[in-house]
């Protein structure tokens, strides 16, 4: 049964150039997380962080990618191009797969904020 | 290239206890978790059990709990299917299978060891 | 359990066509199914996971779609090759269940 919730960072925006912190939280449920996903619209995959091997962060991503805080995911240099979906996965036991999906928007505009609905510390 | 070799299967009285092996060639074991998967002589597939990367983390269904154990040894590019208690209907086909490193599915099979359960 | 319904078990075609293969999940389970092919003395091989991505090294040819209980599988221009066994399994919650099949056979 599966009775967790996923709370995310929700509707984000951040400047060009700058960076952004990805999270996810996942609560309701005492399953346990053995790993958890980051992808991006198109399906690719940033990142891995799996309980017993850590962080993978696939190559592409290797340069502007950066593991946390926690289970999150920190975006740097951002382009206009990551503009976009952006999907967590958590894997659990014996729940499953939960999804938590973040909109990120990257603004030329140097009044861009980064806006969060939570923080986990 | 990406092999897995079951090994082990027979024939086995009710009640008996039967040890399972699957050797693993061509990819970096210890990075991939991996699963157990048998087909029944109807031709049905059912997940049997799953062990981590590490091997901290088994699961199994209901059908196989406390009857099955999980295990491998990462050293050895070995896994195991450890059954007890075995019954008619655990007669099939064994297959073991590799995770993809996202978790998503199995993306590599063996071609399986045959278990037959009868007296 | 997530129960999943396959259909049609058996199905008859010829090479050139196209044909589609379904499974209904007993509830949703998001867009985790995949599918794989059996083919008598070689390996299971994953085709499609997450409902729609395709299996690296699989010809485009084979497409998935579907999310919540709904799933097809779609094999264009049918190739000699192809005529298998073929399986969904869904990846969304423990246990890890499997549709009964569909036997795909030269009409």
């Known amino acids: 049964m599966m009775t967790g919730t996923i709370e995310t960072t929700g509707n984000i925006s951040a400047k060009k150039g700058g960076s952004v912190i990805l999270q996810c939280h996942l609560s309701s449920t005492m399953a346990q997380v053995t790993q958890v996903n980051w992808e991006q619209h198109d399906h690719s995959l940033l990142a891995i962080r799996n309980a017993e091997l850590g962080w993978h962060i696939y190559p592409a991503f290797k340069d502007r990618v950066a593991p946390g805080p926690g289970l999150g995911l920190t975006l740097q240099s951002l382009t206009m191009n990551d503009t976009g979906e952006y999907f967590c996965t958590y894997h659990t036991y014996p729940d499953g797969t939960y999804r938590g999906r973040i909109f990120l928007e990257v603004l030329e505009s140097s009044v861009a904020e980064h806006s969060a609905r939570f923080q986990i510390p | 290239e990406v092999q897995l070799v079951e090994s082990g299967g027979g024939l086995v009285k009710p009640g008996g206890s039967l040890k399972l092996s699957c050797a693993a060639s061509g990819f970096t074991f210890s990075s991939y978790a991996m699963s157990w998967v048998r087909q029944s002589p109807e031709k049905r597939l059912e997940w049997v059990a799953e062990i981590s990367s590490g091997g901290s983390y088994t699961y199994y269904p209901d059908t196989v709990t406390g009857r099955f154990t999980i295990s491998r040894d990462n050293a050895k590019n070995t896994l195991y299917l450890e059954m007890s208690s075995l019954r008619s209907e655990d007669t099939a086909m064994y297959y073991c299978?590799?995770?993809?490193?996202?978790?998503?599915?199995?993306?590599?099979w063996g071609q399986g060891t045959s278990v037959t359960v009868s007296s | 359990d997530v129960q999943i319904t396959q259909s049609p078990s058996y199905l008859a075609a010829s090479p050139g066509e196209t044909i589609t293969i379904n499974c209904r999940a007993s509830?949703?389970?998001?867009?985790?199914l995949a599918w794989y092919q059996e083919k008598p003395g070689k390996t299971n091989k994953l085709l499609i996971y997450s409902g729609s991505t395709l299996q690296s090294g699989i010809p485009s040819r084979f497409s998935g779609s579907g999310s919540g209980t709904d799933f097809t599988l779609t094999i264009s221009s049918l190739e000699p090759e192809d005529f298998a066994m073929y399986y969904c399994q869904q990846h969304n919650e423990y246990p890890w269940t499997f549709g009964g099949g569909t036997k795909l056979e030269i009409k």
């Open positions: 299978a590799r995770k993809r490193r996202d978790y998503y599915a199995m993306d590599y």
């Open positions: 509830k949703s389970i998001s867009k985790y």
